[in-house]
Interface confidence: low
């Protein structure tokens, strides 16, 4: 069976002038997935991103995330790329108020 992921992009305050953007994929099966941040369509190097483990979510499916830190005001240049079981999609950073959340960094 194949269950496609739900992808959600969020943003949180990181430090003065910077935000952390996090791309979360959940509810997918099988567990093999590619998540990566892109700037102006070009993949960021892996050392500028942080990945969460692929973990079971208790429903027979899996979840994971990837995060990166970017300059506030440049959100429109960044997208999250997802590839799973032959399907792929890109997800922009949402506009709007920055949420103050616990950072992964």
């Amino acid at each position: 069976r194949t269950v496609p992921p739900m992808v959600n992009v969020t943003r949180s305050e990181a430090s003065e002038g910077n935000i952390t953007v996090t791309c979360r994929a959940s509810g997918f099966y099988p567990w093999n997935i590619t998540l990566s941040w892109r700037q102006d369509g070009v993949s960021l190097s892996h050392d500028t991103q942080q990945w969460g483990d692929v973990l079971p979510d208790g429903n027979g499916t899996y979840q994971t995330w990837v995060a990166t830190r970017i300059c506030q005001g440049e959100e429109q240049r960044f997208t999250c790329y997802m590839e799973h079981s032959g399907n792929h999609s890109t997800h922009p950073v949402p506009s709007g108020k920055v949420l103050v959340l616990q950072s992964h960094w």
Epitope: T34, V42, H46, D47, Y81, E83, H88
Partner: antibody, heavy 119, light 108 residues
Framework: QVQLQESGPGLVKPSETLSLTCTVS????????GHWIRQPPGKGLEWIGM???????DYNAAFISRVTISVDTSKNQFSLKLSSVTAADTAVYYC?????????????WGQGTLVTVSS | EIVLTQSPGTLSLSPGERATLSCTAS???????LHWYQQKPGQAPRLLIY???NLISGIPDRFSGSGSGTDFTLTISRLEPEDFAVYYC?????????FGQGTKLEIK
């Protein structure tokens, strides 16, 4: 049956452009990405770059000023162009498929084609 | 760049013996992005193990992988004649995405 086949000139003159094509079958380049890797005679493997399923590219910084990887999904082909070649670019060039979820690993490879740079 | 150093350079063993191949990274590599390939003379490499320890379908279970951080290991529990080849580790953790120099596994 998944197959990849490299093609192109076996001899390229110094300062010219090396052009290779990888023709794939058994899968679609709209759902799988592709890599180019090379191996100088008697030496190890060197990653050149890759093309993602939506056409974006990632390159090894060592080649970035002279490499272009492109895709023609209608022909199920992706291509490598390496400009301003020297004798140091003599190698067996491989194309490979980026496996789904294999964290950029290359799950199928072409048999390789030897390109010699010589005048 | 991350340099992958494989050891030993050449390993001479007999069929039936256990082979342990090492791959040491110059800086930490995520286990998700460390892969192993096998290459026989005149052939293209083939993927054996991805993400440190995941065996590719069709690869015999005498092959296994382990490790984390900077130290990774490929183990062949009981060597068969067809296992004698060159083995490469490969990291896709940081660009450029490098290979080790290879370990040649030869018949003693």
């Amino acid at each position: 049956q998944v197959q990849l086949q490299e093609s192109g000139p076996g001899l390229v003159k110094p300062s010219e452009t090396l052009s290779l094509t990888c023709t794939v079958s058994g899968f679609s380049l709209t759902t799988y990405g592709g890599h180019w890797i090379r191996q100088p005679p008697g030496k190890g493997l060197e990653w050149i770059g890759m093309i993602w399923t939506d056409g974006w590219t990632d390159y090894n910084a060592a080649f970035i000023s002279r490499v272009t990887i492109s895709v023609d999904t209608s022909k199920n082909q992706f291509s490598l162009k390496l400009s301003s070649v020297t004798a140091a670019d003599t190698a067996v060039y491989y194309c490979a498929r980026k496996g789904h979820g294999y964290y950029y690993a290359m799950d199928y490879w072409g048999q390789g084609t030897l390109v010699t740079v010589s005048s | 760049e991350i340099v992958l150093t494989q050891s030993p350079g050449t390993l001479s063993l007999s069929p039936g013996e256990r082979a342990t191949l090492s791959c040491t990274a110059s800086s930490s590599v995520s286990s998700s992005y460390l892969h192993w390939y096998q290459q026989k003379p005149g052939q293209a490499p083939r993927l054996l193990i991805y993400s440190t320890s995941n065996l590719i379908s069709g690869i015999p279970d005498r092959f296994s992988g382990s490790g984390s951080g900077t130290d990774f290991t490929l183990t062949i529990s009981r060597l068969e004649p067809e296992d004698f080849a060159v083995y490469y580790c490969h990291q896709y953790h940081r660009s450029p995405f490098t290979f080790g120099q290879g370990t040649k596994l030869e018949i003693k």
